[in-house]
């Protein structure tokens, strides 16, 4: 299953399959997730080691048993790949690293005014993988405001150095934020020239294209079909690049198919997995396990659940079958692709779905009236769980926020439905940033059921929580995916990086905002919060957040929206915007419904009709 816990001051011994430099443990974990063999990783921050060569070292590891011995190493961080973790699987990495220079091949230098502008340039450059920016206070005046666009053979820095007044980060192309746009066309009977960066075997051009999309240096590809004249080259997928970023030439060639990486697509990237099953095809590879199962779909499920399994063949040969069950061969290879593809067999083959980010039809948990005042504009895909709850009576208007917690579930505040309990008047918009982008043609979800907490009373602050079941499940994308819920009664975690988002008022007597706003707000202890509210009881089912001096807060129209906190690289829904004394007033923190206190209720209400919890627990 999915394991999200990180181990501080621990290093996994042995099992190395690859090593690289990464700026932090989260990026290391992401590289492990996308590496075909990596199950575990260990990361050495700069502070943890004197050996300059090993600083920022990210060590990817495999283990037949799924685990390795841990040794104590001060400062080291270790953890698991996020394979099998559904919607948490993403190659998108937005963080900017201050005081760090990520080294690579510098292929472009320009002057820009901010690190965000530099990141945008990198995202809009086809060859840029990462960048470094020298701030206005950099010690050498001639380098100030320089934006260096970079690449490397593996897509990760060739070295990482601690350097004052330098900021580094990665391209946001994997976040589907590139302005370049992409070529979706597949060109039949056409071969591209240029440099081959890798060679893998694939059953069709679509798998070849997805592999190209997630390969750090692949810009385009050529696939040789299973009827290609040279037998040894059949099913070969050649991943390619060029100086210009486009093929310098193409040759008409029977039984070849060419196309482009989809990494530069805006708003939608293909999933990093291959779900199609190929009848009459055998995939060869190293044998992991053989099991008897009923049907090829169960074989694929079995492969998906066995974390080391990369692909499978389900044999229908009479000697491989017993009654209704046949042999399911679970296999792996060094690069995650079959070592041999045979056609005209009595088998069916396919790939593990361990990297599919749709996950199951579930809510995400972890084992471990009230625009945002004083906030700033959010960017695409920054808060993909944020939804807008709108009411359509004569006109249509945004009323509340909400959080997507599963394919078919939204969590919000009960008070959003005060006086409006009718489900047909509501429209739920997900995967949006600007309210002005909503037109009559914009797709929306309708409500199947509104579940208000049984102890909630209109115009009272207690138990201000409600679940919305959508009429139809939503697909997950980089812009529309759920937020993980905290553990039941989560009281031990100290959250220091918390954000509130919404389209609500920007001042007490304001109006709904167009662009989704975000504000970083510190949590306040319940004891402190209680002293600020002389007339209202702050219960253990509430959590407070705000600045002593005020100025930043949730406000009208933000109600029901998320208070999220990042802990160990993972966002969790800590609170639901509920109430407050005005907005952003000095010494008056916002009050939020504490989600951890309602986990039993959420789990109970999101149970599916067959009694199976629609919950995905990554830990």
């Amino acid at each position: 299953g999915c394991l999200t816990q990180l181990y501080e001051n621990a290093f996994f011994r042995g099992g190395d399959v690859a090593s690289m430099y990464t700026p932090n443990a989260q990026y290391c974990q992401m590289r492990c997730t996308f590496h075909p063999r990596c199950l575990l990783f260990s990361f050495l921050p700069a502070s943890s080691i004197n050996d300059m060569e090993k600083r920022f070292g990210c060590f990817l590891k495999d283990s037949v048993t799924g685990t390795l011995p841990k040794v104590h190493r001060t400062g080291a961080v270790s953890g698991h790949s996020l394979k099998q973790c559904g919607h948490q699987i993403s190659a998108c990495h937005r963080d900017i690293y201050k005081g760090v220079d990520m080294r690579g091949v510098n292929f472009n230098v320009s002057k820009v005014s901010s690190v965000e502008e530099c990141q945008k340039r990198c995202t809009s450059n086809i060859r840029c993988q990462f960048f470094s920016y020298a701030t206005q206070t950099f010690h050498k005046a001639e380098y100030r405001n320089n934006c260096l666009l970079k690449y490397s053979p593996g897509g990760t820095p060739t070295a990482i150095k601690v350097l004052s007044n330098v900021e580094s980060g990665f391209s946001l192309k994997p976040c589907a934020l590139s302005e370049i746009g992409c070529h979706m066309n597949i060109f039949q009977h056409l071969a591209f020239s240029d440099v081959d960066v890798a060679r893998v075997l694939t059953p069709d051009a679509f798998v070849c294209r997805t592999i190209c999309t997630y390969h750090p240096n692949c810009l385009f590809f050529t696939f040789y079909t299973n009827v290609w004249k040279i037998e040894s080259q059949r099913n070969v997928c050649l991943l390619k690049t060029s100086e210009s970023g486009t093929p310098s030439s193409s040759t008409p060639q029977e039984n070849t198919i060419s196309g482009y990486s989809l990494l530069t697509c805006k708003r939608t990237l293909p999933e990093p997995c291959h779900s199609k099953i190929y009848p009459g095809v055998d995939f060869g590879g190293e044998e992991l396990n053989v099991t008897f199962v009923k049907g090829v779909n169960v074989c694929q499920e079995t492969c998906t659940k066995m974390i080391r399994c990369q692909f499978f063949t389900y044999s229908l040969l009479p000697e491989d079958c017993k009654e209704e069950k046949c042999k399911c061969f679970l296999r792996l290879s060094m690069d995650g692709s079959p070592t041999r593809i045979a056609y005209g067999t009595q088998g069916s083959s396919g790939y593990s779905l361990r990297l599919c980010n749709t996950g199951d039809n579930s809510v995400c948990t972890t084992k471990t009236s009230t625009r945002i005042v004083g906030g700033t504009n959010s960017s695409w895909g920054e808060w993909p769980w944020q939804v807008s709850l709108q009411v359509k009576l004569t006109a249509q208007r945004h009323l509340c926020g909400g959080s997507l917690i599963g394919h078919q579930w939204v969590l919000t505040a009960a008070h959003c439905f005060d006086g409006l309990p009718l489900q047909d008047v509501w429209r739920i918009y997900s995967g949006i940033l600007n309210l002005s982008d909503i037109t009559k043609d914009t797709p929306f979800s309708q409500i199947k059921e509104i579940i208000i907490h049984q102890n909630y009373k209109v115009s009272e602050g207690n138990h201000d929580i409600a679940l919305i079941k959508l009429q139809a499940p939503l697909n997950y994308t980089e812009f529309q995916k759920p937020i993980c819920l905290p553990s039941k009664g989560d009281t031990s975690t100290i959250y220091t990086n918390c954000w509130v988002t919404g389209w609500g008022f920007s001042k007490e007597k304001g109006e709904i905002q167009n662009i989704l706003q975000k504000v970083n707000i510190p949590l306040v202890t319940n004891e402190e919060c209680q002293k600020r509210y002389q007339d209202y009881k702050i219960t253990q089912r509430m959590v407070c957040a705000g600045y002593k001096e005020g100025g930043k807060d949730a406000c009208k129209g933000d109600s029901g929206g998320p208070l999220v906190c990042k802990h160990n690289g993972m966002w969790r829904l800590v609170g639901i915007t509920s109430w407050g004394e005005g907005c952003a007033r000095r010494e008056q923190p916002g009050v939020y419904t504490k989600v951890a206190e309602y986990m039993d209720w959420i789990l109970e209400k999101t149970q599916s009709s067959d009694g199976k919890a629609q919950m995905q627990s990554p830990a």
Partner: antibody, heavy 116, light 106 residues
Framework: EVQLQQSGAELVKPGASVRLSCTAS????????IFWVKQRPKQGLEWIGR????????KYDPKIQGKATLTADTSSNTAYLQLSSLTSEDSAIYYC?????????WGQGTLVSVSA | DIQMTQSPSSLSASVGDRVTITCEAS??????IAWYQQKPGQPPKLLIY???TLQSGVPSRFSGSGSGTEFTLTISNLQPEDFATYYC????????FGQGTKVEIK
């Protein structure tokens, strides 16, 4: 309208006990804290303690601990103050009050006279 | 525990006067001080909390100030209905009242 109705005056003998009541209307006592405050004749105010009727959690002034016991009955929306081993020092007006961080609304008070 | 020393214990003033009452805490109370007004035969009434925040419905002639351990209640334009006893209350650590200040007609 928020109201706290306190029980009538009590004349009690030294060494005895007394139970004072505070019945709320216009709100549910589970949604607030109930505080008790003592005021001796011609003297100042002294905080006795606080109860959270939702879970019966209590906090007392350390100087008064043992003298006073706070309880609540959510079904009748009533809070109680029990005073034991009474002496003349306990003769006072006892107020109940509701609030969050501090006492925002008060009852009219109950006079307790301890006399042989 | 925290002690609150209120002064003066009584004062005489006329309608229209500016009246100042002070309260000194034995420790820093992080501005968690409230002021109450009590008239004979009535329960106390909350005027100000968190040093300077006026409770709704309280006239603006009442104001509070201070920080650390020294706090002040000011009545800027004394009205006939303001003759009463005033108490400070610290609520940073449990609750402690000051001894009270009686404001009488001169």
């Amino acid at each position: 309208e928020v109201q706290l109705q306190q029980s009538g005056a009590e004349l009690v003998k030294p060494g005895a006990s007394v139970r004072l009541s505070c019945t709320a209307s216009g709100f549910n006592i589970k949604d607030t804290y109930i505080f008790w405050v003592k005021q001796r004749p011609k003297q100042g105010l002294e905080w006795i303690g606080r109860i959270d009727p939702e879970n019966d959690n209590t906090k007392y002034d350390p100087k008064i601990q043992g003298k006073a016991t706070l309880t609540a009955d959510t079904s009748s929306n009533t809070a109680y103050l029990q005073l034991s081993s009474l002496t003349s020092e306990d003769s006072a007006i006892y107020y109940c009050a509701k609030g969050g961080g501090l006492f925002a609304y008060w009852g009219q008070g109950t006079l307790v006279s301890v006399s042989a | 525990d925290i002690q609150m020393t209120q002064s003066p214990s009584s004062l005489s003033a006329s309608v229209g006067d500016r009246v100042t009452i002070t309260c000194e805490a034995s420790h820093d109370i992080n501005n968690y001080i409230a002021w109450y007004q009590q008239k004979p035969g009535q329960p106390p009434k909350l005027l100000i909390y968190y040093t300077s925040t006026l409770q709704s419905g309280v006239p603006s002639r009442f104001s509070g100030s201070g920080s650390g351990t020294e706090f002040t209640l000011t009545i800027s334009n004394l009205q006939p209905e303001d003759f009463a006893t005033y108490y400070c209350l610290q609520y940073d650590n449990l609750f402690t009242f000051g001894q009270g200040t009686k404001v009488e007609i001169k």
